[in-house]
Amino acid sequence: GSMGHAPKVGRLIYTAGGYFRQSLSYLEAYNPSDGTWLDLADLQVPRSGLAGCVVGGLLYAVGGRNNSPDGNTDSSALDCYNPMTNQWSPCAPMSVPRNRIGVGVIDGHIYAVGGSHGCIHHNSVERYEPERDEWHLVAPMLTRRIGVGVAVLNRLLYAVGGFDGTNRLNSAECYYPERNEWRMITAMNTIRSGAGVCVLHNCIYAAGGYDGQDQLNSVERYDVETETWTFVAPMKHRRSALGITVHQGRIYVLGGYDGHTFLDSVECYDPDTDTWSEVTRMTSGRSGVGVAVTME
């Protein structure tokens, strides 16, 4: 990545790290308004299976692992990228390494959910306070989950699907911060590990993933009012370990693995027409990216 200053533009879709033959250190940003990609400052350490989020206009890269020819190291790292300076800086590490982690943000705090360290599959969850640069454990999930999809809706944290070390999961659970407790919610129609999970228009969407047999292109959404999961239009590509985010009322899915190929495809879902369209390609195929959108 280049080390020059990043252009000061509006909302960009950032994609950090990922995997293709080895873990990657790329940071790239897609501008949906003009279809261009920016090459930004590399992560200080390559990583895949990480998660991305934005707090206070800063991009955070959380967990993952560095799978390289020299070895394989799960990461407890939290790194912060400032779009104004195009620079990364390390923050306080998590209590444990978490590969294939999920993250969500509530009230400016980052929740790191599940993930793995070697063959240990975590049910633990910890919360980061940026103003103190501190992590603190909160209540553990009811289920061990790696490849977990995490989303926040109405100040509640949802953990969806994943892999518990024995089975891929269709179960989902919800964390109530005020009570510091988890409760199971309605299970998805489909087993999904490594799915993309996000919130759009008061619904939680789960896109793609892996059911223990095959990569999926199906997509379903959870209505918190009716507590039901309903299928919507499928993606054009089957994919697991994909990146996902929401930009201006549309869902974007980035990359992933289809069982044979590392995808460069980026698809966009329009809820008004219930359709997916190919909008761009990443500069190279990859899985296990961390994705987030800058605030305006």
Epitope: Y19, F163, T166, G259
Partner: antibody, heavy 121, light 107 residues
């Protein structure tokens, strides 16, 4: 019947290349992690490489990293080990194995019969 | 890398004997240890996974146990078909490593 059958072994000169195949039947390789394990003549077992069916990520022993490539073709239900820059110390019987986590917590519960690779001038 | 030190390297026993083979991990591997049986010219066969779980179809005379970083394979009553080489393997962390093997021979 659940089965793995390796092929592609043989005699090759130092610096040469071979591609081993591992054909699966009775199960889908997309549902399992696939591993290659080797055994030098009269020696013990050595893990070589693995591929994860969910993320596509691969892992290699340091002794082969950068020279060997594991891959899988789900349409052919076959896994491969591309071996380049072969050395005398790569001489071994190469086994393909699978682990299905729901069966045996990452332990390799199905093995092929092995294929012999001899690296010699 | 995690070393799996297996002992003894060989042993002689008679049919009906109780046989114990030990693997010591150089650091914690939780319970992520498997045991395999291999006969000459054949592929290994899984006996025990997760330190103590008997794999399906394996006779109940085989058992596994864990005490900290020490792992034990026990054959309660050795049968003629059990004469083979046995390997432990840790899959707790990359790279997966095997013990050097224990050859069980007829006394």
């Amino acid at each position: 019947e659940v089965q793995l059958v390796e092929s592609g072994g043989g005699l090759v000169q130092p610096g040469g290349s071979l591609r081993l195949s591992c054909a699966a039947s009775g199960f889908a390789i997309s549902a399992s992690s696939i591993h290659w394990v080797r055994q030098a003549p009269g020696k013990g077992l050595e893990w070589v490489a693995s591929i994860d069916p969910e993320t596509g990520e691969t892992l290699y022993a340091k002794s082969v990293a950068g020279r060997f490539t594991i891959s899988a073709d789900t349409s052919k239900n076959t896994a491969y080990l591309q071996m380049n820059s072969l050395r005398a110390e790569d001489t071994a019987v190469y086994y393909c194995a699978r682990s299905a986590a729901s069966d045996a917590a990452y332990a390799a519960n199905v093995w092929g019969q092995g294929t012999l690779v001899t690296v010699s001038s | 890398d995690i070393q799996m030190t297996q002992s003894p390297s060989s042993l002689s026993a008679s049919v009906g004997d109780r046989v114990t083979i030990t693997c010591r991990a150089s650091q914690s591997v939780s319970s992520a240890v498997a045991w395999y049986q291999q006969k000459p010219g054949k592929a290994p066969k899984l006996l025990i996974y997760s330190a103590s779980s008997l794999y399906s179809g394996v006779p109940s005379r085989f058992s596994g146990s864990r005490s900290g970083t020490d792992f034990t394979l026990t054959i309660s009553s050795l049968q003629p078909e059990d004469f083979a080489t046995y390997y432990c393997q840790q899959s707790y962390s990359f790279p997966s490593t095997f013990g050097q093997g224990t050859k069980v021979e007829i006394k």
